[in-house]
Amino acid sequence: EVEKTACPSGKKAREIDESLIFYKKWELEACVDAALLATQMDRVNAIPFTYEQLDVLKHKLDELYPQGYPESVIQHLGYLFLKMSPEDIRKWNVTSLETLKALLEVNKGHEMSPQVATLIDRFVKGRGQLDKDTLDTLTAFYPGYLCSLSPEELSSVPPSSIWAVRPQDLDTCDPRQLDVLYPKARLAFQNMNGSEYFVKIQSFLGGAPTEDLKALSQQNVSMDLATFMKLRTDAVLPLTVAEVQKLLGPHVEGLKAEERHRPVRDWILRQRQDDLDTLGLGLQGGIPNGYLVLDLSMQEALS
């Protein structure tokens, strides 16, 4: 808290300009009118104020707007945004994408801070859903943004927004998130032809069910091993050796290098050894000849 002291004669600020950097904290408090500051916020960013001076400016705005800053002020906060707490930001009503971009720019190159997370949360809740433009903006600043959302939050993403998603945006998504995103992607890309469709859907396949993988195996897609390794274990297990061979195409040889890893390891154990031998890769651990192959889906449902 800065003590209330009278402004010295001749020091009353008529403009927000560089002369203010020579003011002591108490002089800033006494001589800068909060309403003036609010109308000339765009100038603050160009002036090399100290952190202590910025604290005073923030204090003045807090007094002027105890219920939260108006968007006209928020849009021009610049580096003063870094002084805001999540509690401050929860009072705001940010509706303009331009405002959001301006504030994200301030934090660019840094991890997502609690302030930024709160700002994004307020913005998205205000809009009601993650529209394409918002998603475009957020993933441009934070490629991992999509994967930071809960499955429940992802359910509000409209299929049209999926066009904004790049493969790297999904790098840290877990299976539950991909379970939500995959059906949206499938819907978004449904009118594309085979090879183009596969290019777009590939990053989302960690949420694909068995029947979709079976369908893809009939389309000569040549899925790479990195994608195959990210598929849901329960979706891979029912695939036959022939289906996996068709799905992977020339990449099928890579199964040997992955035989100790999931989901390949689990899949191998479910196949007849005779069938595995047809691949000519030396994969071992399949069900020996003469063994009854159980209806595993039924077994697992029962157990």
Partner: antibody, heavy 120, light 107 residues
Framework: QVQLQESGPGLVKPSQTLSLTCTVS??????????WSWIRQPPGKGLEWIGY???????YYNPSLKSRVTISVDTSKNQFSLKLSSVTAADTAVYYC????????????WGQGTMVTVSS | DIQMTQSPSSLSASVGDRVTITCRAS??????LNWYQQKPGKAPKLLIY???SLQSGVPSRFSGSGSGTDFTLTISSLQPEDFATYYC?????????FGGGTKVEIK
């Protein structure tokens, strides 16, 4: 409710073979959705996976123990077994059998464990 | 083999505290990461599977997050029955491996 129960001698002499059996009750070991594992824990230390077996008889062993380990399954008795040869004092541990779900990759059911001491 | 490194190895906390335990894999394991709780003289008990899914019957104060190499177990409000040792375990690749454990003690 599936339950696992380890059985076998609590004392084994050095250089001999440790033999333990795990009996599965409340469900079939032939259910294809699970791997049947052995895990051990030396006194005051962490957990070490020994290996597992699938109902078909396929096995995976920890390479650090592979030369000494055999895991087998008897589906008719609903049991699977562990044999660890040429034991030393370093093999003294609580031995657990556990069920691993192929879907989740997690050990969702464990036996209560049996303490095996290697000493002459 | 994939090494699993847990930290801290032990911690002291009070009832009601928020507790976070981390687990790091020596290479990417996707989401094939499980968490267990073990009390003295008892077998481990599964808490979280597939990095973030809560095992049936486990209280909702336990949660897991992470993907790739870095994972976290969080207990939102520590209860008297939560004082135990916690282990992470990767199930991506054989040999299956566990973290060294984190002992949660009463402060």
């Amino acid at each position: 409710q599936v339950q696992l129960q380890e059985s076998g001698p609590g004392l084994v002499k050095p250089s001999q073979t440790l033999s333990l059996t795990c009996t599965v009750s409340g469900g079939s070991i032939s259910s294809g959705g699970y791997y049947w594992s052995w895990i051990r824990q030396p006194p005051g230390k962490g957990l070490e996976w020994i290996g597992y077996i699938y109902y078909s008889g396929s096995t995976y062993y920890n390479p650090s123990l592979k030369s000494r380990v055999t895991i087998s399954v008897d589906t008719s008795k609903n049991q699977f077994s562990l044999k660890l040869s040429s034991v030393t004092a370093a093999d003294t541990a609580v031995y657990y059998c556990a069920r691993e779900s192929t879907g989740t990759g997690a050990f969702d059911i464990w036996g209560q464990g049996t303490m095996v001491t290697v000493s002459s | 083999d994939i090494q699993m490194t847990q930290s801290p190895s032990s911690l002291s906390a009070s009832v009601g505290d928020r507790v976070t335990i981390t687990c790091r894999a020596s290479q990417s394991i996707s989401s094939y990461l499980n968490w267990y709780q073990q009390k003295p003289g008892k077998a481990p008990k599964l808490l979280i599977y597939a990095a973030s899914s809560l095992q049936s019957g486990v209280p909702s104060r336990f949660s897991g997050s992470g993907s790739g190499t870095d994972f976290t177990l969080t207990i939102s409000s520590l209860q008297p029955e939560d004082f135990a040792t916690y282990y992470c375990q990767q199930s991506y690749s054989t040999p299956l491996t566990f973290g060294g454990g984190t002992k949660v003690e009463i402060k």
